[in-house]
């Protein structure tokens, strides 16, 4: 018998969708071979309708796809907008249609149940509202109006114009009789339950002259939308529950094995700790719709998710919901990368953020996740150069190394920098990822002065001490601006006395400004890099003042001042629901990217040795 397995019978109704899952032994060959869905013809041949190699037949165009999940040994065929013509015998299989690795599936698409003549059909999702329209003749205008539910051969009164309300519909039903001249009454049922499903009868008057109208109410469980996302990527659940619940608390929950639904996040401030740092509930629109973004997807995030509305911020029967079945594909296009980056107080981190390599021209962003209320992520920096003011001089977004990765450097770290950050672009939103920065005990590896005051027209020499572990790295100085950090010439001055354990390999690399001009005022970084991958950085602020005393000025670490106070920006910053991640090659260290070209005006010199080694305390 064939080792392929699936549903032998699939039945649905016109207009619906089906999602057919086929199972195969996940051997190496099977995982990567062609998967197909074909229809068996009278001749016995099986005509391919959709395959894993991208083929889609003309009658499936725009309504079908096939997704392979090699790590699970499954593939899924989705077919939408079913018609009765889709009824028939099919095969899902591996390899070539005519060979043995396949499974027979019978698909039956029906029209739906037969109803009495003139029956109006109302199809509504559970939790929503339905308005049943009941016409009547003038002679029945003054008479009793009623709605009955047909159960078997009997009719049960639901509501009438004499103020009777069936207890099953208490507080969620009303009968409206319009003014004179309008020969129609309506029954409105709110917060529909699955048990409301069935055939109803409107009646006006009694005896042989009564008016009757049949209504078939179909209350649908929300059909879970199947969502397939990559491991480490991002998913967005868009939830539109209708105006009726626009002002009611909203939630997203995940169905657990006990058949209850655990709140993942709600608008009342509740959030599951498993999603800390990687979830945002975007504020709702006027129509009550909202979306939830989850980044850094894990295999354990798989499952059934429901969004809904209820004053308690959690699932209650009879309130509107939407459903998704999330699958997380382990064979991810998103590169593996550290989810935690470590730095020391006063030190730096370099975070590698992935983006879809097909979107090299997209704008890149970095934002700080804030957990308050529903979560928000104010932008800190973007590739066009805007930086939040309080990060001036210590944050830079670099396009390198490119080809699917950009780099963010943050230095002058304090304990307040600990937290979750998102890498984003204005392109493919599935590539958003999260990185957590942790501040650990330790000393920065690079030693530079604190504030430096330079004198106009004179020479300024700023030293940067690199420990021996960076002996093979390229050392550089650059001048920070909000569009990046422009590399400057620098001078290797031999071994540094700041590191006594390996004098020959430690380095003192100086930046010389000669002569100092007004334009030289600002932030300077010294750092290490290996090719396009950046490591640690240290920052110095240079203030420029009028000449008071003649002579050149050399600043040693002993004369360093404290760093200047950071400026603080008000919080009116744009927020984004986009993306973040890092390069798998940099599992043990952050490196940085930028060769930003020559600096106009200011300094001259040459850069010392380049290579790479693992970084210590202030890196990861």
């Amino acid at each position: 018998k064939s080792p392929v397995f699936g549903p032998q019978e699939v039945s649905s109704v016109e207009g619906n969708s089906v999602s057919i899952k086929c199972y195969y032994p996940p051997t190496s060959v099977n995982r990567h071979t062609r998967k197909y869905w074909c229809r068996k013809g009278a001749s016995g041949r099986c005509i391919t309708l959709v395959s894993s190699e991208g083929y889609v037949s003309s009658n499936y165009a725009g309504r079908a796809n096939l997704t392979n999940f090699p790590e699970n040994g499954t593939f899924v065929v989705n077919i939408a907008q079913l018609s009765r013509d889709d009824s028939g015998h099919y095969k899902c299989g591996l390899g070539i249609n005519s060979r043995g690795l396949s499974f027979d599936v019978s698909l039956e698409v029906s029209q739906g149940p037969e109803l009495p003549n003139g029956t109006e059909v109302y199809t509504v999702d559970v939790g929503r509202t339905v308005t049943i329209k009941c016409p009547f003749k003038t002679e029945n205008a003054p008479k009793t109006k009623a709605l009955y539910k047909k159960i078997g051969q009997t009719s049960v009164l639901v509501i009438d114009s004499r103020n009777y309300v069936n207890p099953n519909y208490k507080d969620r039903i009303r009968l409206r009789i319009p003014g004179t001249g309008q020969l129609i009454f309506t029954v409105v049922i709110d917060r529909l339950r699955l048990s409301d499903h069935g055939l109803y009868l409107c009646q006006a008057g009694d005896g042989s002259n009564r008016d009757e109208k049949n209504a078939d109410l179909q209350v649908l469980e929300p059909e879970p939308e199947l969502v397939y996302e990559d491991l480490r990527g991002s998913v967005t659940f868009h939830c539109a529950l209708g105006l009726e619940v626009a002002n009611v608390a909203k939630f997203l929950c995940r169905v657990n094995s006990r058949e209850t639904c655990d709140v993942v996040i709600n608008t009342l401030g509740k959030r599951d700790s498993a999603f800390e740092g990687r979830i945002l509930l975007n504020p709702q629109d006027k129509d009550g719709s909202f979306s939830v973004v989850i980044t850094g997807l894990r295999k354990e995030d798989e499952g059934r998710y429901l969004c809904g509305a209820h004053s308690d911020g959690q699932l209650q029967e009879g309130w509107p919901i939407q459903a998704w079945q999330l699958f997380v594909n382990e064979e991810s296009t998103i590169p593996r990368s550290p989810t935690v980056v470590k730095g020391v107080a006063g030190g730096s981190v370099a975070v590698l953020c992935p983006y879809n390599p097909k979107e090299s021209q997209s704008l890149k962003y970095w934002c700080l996740w804030e957990g308050a209320q529903n979560g928000r992520c104010p932008l800190l920096v973007e590739s066009q150069g805007l930086v939040q003011e309080q990060y001036e001089g210590r944050l830079s977004l670099l396009q390198e190394p490119g080809n699917g990765t950009f780099t963010v450097i943050l230095n002058q770290l304090t304990t307040q920098d600990a937290g979750f950050y998102w890498c984003l672009t204005n392109g493919d939103t599935r590539w958003r990822t999260t990185v957590e920065i942790k501040i650990i005990e330790g000393e920065p590896n690079l030693k530079v002065p604190g504030n430096v005051t330079a004198v106009l027209g004179e020479t300024l020499n700023i030293p940067c001490h690199f420990p021996c572990k960076f002996s093979s790295y390229e050392k550089y100085w650059c001048k920070w601006s909000n569009t990046g950090c422009q590399t400057l010439p620098s001078q290797d001055e031999g071994p540094s006395e700041a590191f006594v354990n390996c004098d020959e390999n430690s380095r003192l690399v100086s930046l010389t400004l000669n002569p100092v001009t007004r334009a030289d005022e600002g932030w300077y970084w010294c750092g290490v890099k290996q090719g396009h991958f950046y490591g640690e950085t240290a920052a110095v602020y240079v203030a420029v003042e009028e000449k008071k005393v003649a002579g050149s000025r050399y600043v040693s670490p002993a004369k360093a001042d404290a760093a200047p106070d950071e400026k603080v920006l008000d919080s009116g910053v744009r927020e984004i629901e986009n993306k973040a991640i890092q390069d798998p090659r940099l599992f043990a260290e952050e490196k940085v990217v930028a060769d930003t070209g020559d600096q106009a005006g200011g300094s001259r010199a040459s850069v010392d040795s380049s290579s790479s080694e693992e970084q210590g305390g202030s890196s990861k």
Epitope: P7, S12, S17, Y23, N72, T74, P222, V255, E259, E302
Partner: nanobody, 126 residues
Framework: EVQLVESGGGLVQAGDSLRLSCAAS????????VGWFRQAPGKEREFVTT??????????YYADSVKGRFTISRDNAKNTVYLQMNSLKPDDTAVYYC?????????????????WGQGTQVTVSS
């Protein structure tokens, strides 16, 4: 919690038919699939059939050993799943268990099911 109660088991002759019922109660609104498994004395619990659904779409899975003889169906209004067993064989003798799941990765795997009934005995004599 979801409670499952099986009924309809009994003693029949080879070639006869039997219809088992599995009635679900409790928080069934998120139930995604209900299956039947069987266990003969001294043997592992074995997959028989499962029905999963999404709205008005049903998916029916059968073990090779029962294909063409057994039929699974459900009555949504009664929260009940049925197993119609025709052309019964002595090999079909076992305790039949009903099981329900919220999310099924593979319907053949017993550990994928969250809730189980107590079982009903089916004996087929030759």
């Amino acid at each position: 919690e979801v409670q499952l109660v099986e009924s309809g088991g009994g003693l029949v002759q080879a070639g006869d038919s039997l219809r088992l019922s599995c009635a679900a109660s409790g928080r069934t609104f998120t139930t995604y699939g209900v299956g039947w498994f069987r266990q003969a004395p001294g043997k592992e619990r074995e997959f028989v059939t499962t029905i999963t659904w999404s709205g008005s779409t049903n998916y029916k899975y059968y073990a090779d050993s029962v294909k063409g003889r057994f039929t699974i169906s459900r009555d949504n209004a009664k929260n009940t799943v049925y197993l119609q067993m025709n052309s019964l064989k002595p090999d079909d003798t076992a305790v039949y268990y009903c099981a329900a799941s919220t999310v099924l990765t593979d319907p053949r795997v017993p550990t994928e099911y969250d809730y189980w009934g107590q079982g009903t005995q089916v004996t087929v004599s030759s």
